[in-house]
Interface confidence: low
């Protein structure tokens, strides 16, 4: 029997991703969407997406239970995407559970989104 793992998102104010209009601002940082609720299984792959846009382009960091996420070759990685950043965990284990937070900053402002993997 598969053990279910799901991600529940902390709701935060969002706005639609409208780069064209946002780029007219001198500086901005927007959380475009909170982390989505997902359900997956042990041994499978989970992806957490930090969907932000900004000018200048934001720097995004990942935290698990308030500590920086440490990448593991071929298993746990994060990288920049079109929408911000993606954290991918392969071969899920029960030890992967916890609170995941992405923090984005453009040097002036900070936005964050938190999800729970359990």
């Amino acid at each position: 029997q598969e053990t279910e793992l799901s991600v529940s998102a902390e709701l935060v104010p969002t706005s639609s991703w409208n780069i064209s209009s946002e780029l007219n601002k001198d500086s901005y940082l927007t959380l475009d969407e909170p982390m989505n609720n997902i359900t997956t299984s042990l041994g499978q792959t989970a992806e957490l997406h930090c969907k932000v846009s900004g000018n200048p382009p934001p720097t995004i960091r990942w935290f698990k239970n308030d500590a920086p996420v440490v990448q593991e070759p071929r298993r746990l990685s994060f990288r920049s995407t079109i929408y911000g950043s993606r954290l991918r965990i392969r071969n899920l284990d029960t030890t992967d559970t916890g609170y995941f937070q992405c923090v984005a900053t453009n040097g002036k402002e900070v936005v964050s989104s938190t999800g729970v993997l359990f």
């Epitope: 780029l23 989505n36 997902i38 997406h49 200048p56 382009p57 929408y83 993606r86």
Partner: antibody
Framework: QVQLVQSGAEVKKPGASVKVSCKAS????????MHWVRQAPGQGLEWMGW????????KFNHKFDGRVTMTRDTSTSTVYMELSSLRSEDTAVYYC???????WGQGTMVTVSS | DIQMTQSPSSLSASVGDRVTITCQAS??????LIWFQQKPGKAPKSLIY???SLANGVPSRFSGSGSGTDFTLTISSLQPEDFATYYC?????????FGPGTKVDIK
């Protein structure tokens, strides 16, 4: 592994509509944007828009406003792109691609001819 | 819309050559640029993200540089499997726009 499997080739008359499907497996459909890109024979790539299957939100290239519709069926992990009022210049291979263009479907050839 | 131009439109090279392809945006796009490789009859494959970051599984002979309006894709030592068409894509502003492509063929 991640796979995007598209529906088969279509031949349509000018003025008709075509609906292309893209079935996803190996990843969570609802947490990834799905883009549609087309390529006319011997030509370059053209972005048509995206759908976010988690909530059905869409964003289109204004060139296609009013002619393109993107929908999803999360129960079958399938996304659809429908293009209406077809004309000969819509003859192209239509591709679906997820999120940051990591994975692509094999393409669907749509031929518009009278 | 942001216009993307590429040069050259085509080039002939030999295995082992160093190949450089440039992409220019009509306005500042920061580092919001992807490079793709496409072979005949196949879907494009991503090579470089955020102008300089190598995609998973892509050989290290591929590299990207640039920011703002001018970008470069370099293949340090061309291999037989690298003969293809290369496209850049900007995702700084909607609509996302591709460059017209650069075809790399055998000399």
């Amino acid at each position: 592994q991640v796979q995007l499997v598209q529906s088969g080739a279509e031949v349509k008359k000018p003025g008709a509509s075509v609906k292309v499907s893209c079935k996803a497996s190996g990843y969570t459909l609802t947490t990834n944007y799905m883009h549609w890109v087309r390529q006319a024979p011997g030509q370059g790539l053209e972005w048509m828009g995206w759908i976010y299957p988690g909530n059905g939100n869409t964003k289109f290239n204004h060139k296609f406003d009013g002619r393109v519709t993107m929908t999803r069926d999360t129960s079958t992990s399938t996304v659809y792109m429908e293009l209406s009022s077809l004309r000969s210049e819509d003859t192209a291979v239509y591709y679906c691609a997820i999120s940051d263009f990591d994975y692509w479907g094999q393409g669907t050839m749509v031929t518009v001819s009278s | 819309d942001i216009q993307m131009t590429q040069s050259p439109s085509s080039l002939s090279a030999s295995v082992g050559d160093r190949v450089t392809i440039t992409c220019q945006a009509s306005q500042d796009i920061g580092n919001n640029l992807i490079w793709f490789q496409q072979k005949p009859g196949k879907a494009p494959k991503s090579l470089i993200y955020f102008a300089t970051s190598l995609a998973n599984g892509v050989p290290s002979r591929f590299s990207g540089s640039g920011s703002g309006t001018d970008f470069t894709l370099t293949i340090s030592s061309l291999q037989p499997e690298d003969f293809a068409t290369y496209y850049c894509l900007q995702y700084r502003e909607y609509p996302l726009t591709f460059g017209p492509g650069t075809k790399v063929d055998i000399k």
